[in-house]
């Protein structure tokens, strides 16, 4: 027989069917010129010492071989003895190792099957109802196919489904959408209505993310708070990567999964701007507000399940950076500013209410005083802090208050609202003779002692009714008694006590009067 | 080895219908199958074959447009289904298995295992 032509004789060699998985697969038989044909074949296993035979029964029954040697590629003319015209059945047999290994078979009329190519350049992928529906442009000239497509996941092997035919300048197909995994998807045509035309090669992979991106599985750690107000939320554990199917991992577009960070910064609710959402990669710098941050990932079909975590307000107090006076025209804070062209948030809230009843005020933008202060004013008839409370008073500032991540904490204080000099007198004075010469004072703590920082301190005043001397005694902020030495028996003295805050003396208390009695020896 | 067990075969009036069925033990995915039929005092002769996908398919021409061999490969069986059967179909008909697929498909030297047949008969 000559090579260029198919030979109707027994094959050069015996039949010794292997039975195994590899072999011979994906034969594709089509004109490729006028007169010209081609099959192609890929072949699974050791290749060493692999002869290759096109087999080919025609419609007559009659039977015939081309030899391809190792190449898994053969071309021939309508003038090699196989029907172009008719119906064949072809297959190809290897071979190898003393064994026969054949191929599936394809039945078709050659010279109407034409070489279709897969979907080619972009496949664009969506949802639509609960399916994935992908869309690509046909090839050119080869409108009318039959489409297949196969799919696998990380865990499952490749299953093959059906896109039905196709008749238009774009094609389309409805694959099944996994909720919770990410899947490989190849897609394949061949000619429509050609009896037995051969497969197009498979396409690129196309990579499709789970329906419901995965929920991120996350922790922070938020930094101590800074001295210019600001603190590092960091990230502990990296969001889990979605496994990815075989033919997907490396460069896998379309199974990305974006996690985003949104902040909510719950401290100062009268700002513009209460939430930012940043990309995870990129951890911001917070003040020492209350935040709530959520991470939520999302992939090409929109977002996912959110996770949520709350970050407490930074209860560091500064002692001494705020002075307040207050006047008969109301209250003026001072602090020291922290740059030109600063908007500042002054928040109060009554200790030991919730949080939900903060409220705030936020300035214009303004500069420093020639003292270098900041300062925001309120009259009494505004009722800001007006009640005879303890309040605790935060102030953020921002020279961008648009920009939610650019808050700083300037301060965080308490501050006795009302008028604190006689809502901090102390009650309940009472006097204990202690000694021959000396008493013992006692008082009800200050209400001032309830709001941390603010009481400086107590003072007892003595006064001498006889010689009408007074002497006073400061007291420690955290004491209620003292005792007041080298008196005179049968002399009336009164005792007043006042609570002293950094910035306002205290009232004093009601006079209390008391004398040691004068003792008589036997 | 492959053991082929024919059945369906019968008695029936011209143009009527029967459908023989061909059951092979051990897989036969791998080989063409065939018919063929032997009348009393004559040779063997082809009938029909399919391939193993049973994309291919070949009839005699006597038989053409009346005949029709499938197969299942999932349950290993070849049928052929005869419709408008005429007396000249009277024959024993056998179920045939090739492994090789040498130069024919209608050769019955090419075929190496065969059922025991089963008979059909067409009155007139």
């Known amino acids: 027989c000559r090579t260029s032509e198919c030979c109707f004789q027994d094959p050069p060699y015996p039949d010794a069917d292997s039975g195994s998985a590899s072999g011979p697969r994906d034969l594709r038989c089509y004109r490729i010129s006028s007169d010209r044909y081609e099959c192609s074949w890929q072949y699974e296993g050791p290749t060493a010492g692999v002869s290759h035979f096109l087999r080919c029964c025609l419609s007559s029954g009659r039977c015939c071989y081309f030899a391809a040697g190792s190449a898994t590629r053969l071309q021939f003319s309508d003038q090699a003895g196989v029907s172009v015209l008719y119906t064949v059945t072809l297959w190809v047999e290897s071979w190898a190792r003393n064994q026969t290994e054949k191929s599936p078979e394809v039945t078709l009329q050659l010279y109407n099957s034409v070489k279709y190519e897969p979907p080619l350049g972009d496949i664009k992928v969506s949802k639509l109802a609960g399916q994935l529906r992908m869309e690509w442009e046909t090839p050119d000239n080869q409108v009318g196919a039959e489409v297949q497509f196969r799919h696998r996941t990380p865990s499952s092997p490749w299953k093959l489904g059906d896109c039905g035919p196709q008749d238009d300048d774009t094609e389309s197909c409805l694959c099944p959408l996994e909720m919770n995994v990410a899947q490989e998807f190849q897609l394949r045509r061949r000619q429509l209505g050609s009896q037995g035309s051969s497969w197009s090669k498979w396409s690129s992979p196309v990579c499709v993310p789970p329906e419901n991106p995965p929920q991120p599985q996350v922790r922070f750690s938020v930094e101590q708070l800074g001295q210019d107000g600001r603190r590092r939320l960091t990230l502990k554990e990296q969001p889990t990567q979605l496994e990815l199917p075989e033919g997907c991992q490396g460069l896998a577009p379309g199974t990305e999964v974006t996690y985003r960070l949104q902040l909510h910064m719950l401290s100062c609710p009268c700002k513009a701007k209460a939430t930012r959402t940043l990309h995870l990669g990129k951890m911001p710098y917070l003040s020492g507000a209350a935040y709530n941050v959520a991470v939520i990932s999302s992939n090409q079909f929109g977002p996912g399940l959110n996770q949520t975590w709350h970050i407490p307000a930074d209860t560091h107090t500064e002692p001494v950076a705020l002075n307040i006076s207050v006047g008969t025209n109301g209250t003026t804070m001072y602090w020291p500013a922290r740059a030109q062209s600063m908007t500042y948030c002054i928040e109060w809230q009554p200790v030991g209410q919730d949080g939900g009843l903060a409220t705030c005020s936020l300035t214009a933008p303004q500069d420093p005083d020639p003292a270098g202060m900041a300062t925001y004013s309120w009259s009494r008839e505004s009722g800001a802090m007006g009640q005879e409370k303890c309040y605790y008073i935060t102030i953020f500032a921002s020279a961008h208050p648009e920009k939610l991540t650019l808050w700083s904490t300037v301060l965080s204080t308490y501050h006795f609202g009302g008028n604190a000099s006689a809502a901090g007198t102390p009650h309940h004075v009472s006097v204990k003779n202690h000694s021959l010469d000396s008493v013992s004072v006692d008082w009800a703590p200050s209400l001032l002692s309830t709001c941390p920082g603010v009481l400086k301190e107590y003072v007892v005043r003595c006064r001498d009714e006889d010689s009408k001397q007074v002497s006073e005694h400061p007291v420690q902020p955290t004491e209620t008694q003292v005792t007041l030495s080298g008196l005179r028996a049968g002399v009336a003295y009164t005792v007043q006590v006042r609570a002293d805050t950094a910035w306002l003396r205290g009232v004093w208390s009601q006079p209390q009067r008391f004398s040691i009695e004068v003792q008589v020896s036997d | 080895q492959v053991q082929l067990v024919e059945s369906g075969g019968g008695l029936v009036q011209a143009g009527g219908s029967l459908r023989l069925s061909c059951l092979a033990s051990?897989?036969?995915?791998?080989?063409?199958m065939g018919w063929f039929r032997q009348a009393p005092g004559k040779e063997r002769e082809f009938v029909a074959a399919i391939s193993r996908s049973g994309g291919g398919t070949w009839y005699a021409d006597s038989v053409k447009g009346r005949f029709a061999i499938s197969r299942d490969n999932a349950k290993n069986t070849v049928n052929l289904q005869m419709n408008s059967l005429k007396r000249e179909d009277t024959a024993v008909y056998y179920c045939?298995?090739?492994?090789?697929?040498?130069?024919?498909?209608?050769?019955?030297?090419?075929?190496?295992?065969w059922g025991q047949g089963t008979q059909v008969t067409v009155e007139p």
């Open positions: 051990g897989r036969t995915s791998n080989y063409f």
């Open positions: 045939a298995a090739d492994r090789r697929t040498g130069t024919s498909v209608y050769t019955v030297d090419e075929y190496d295992y």
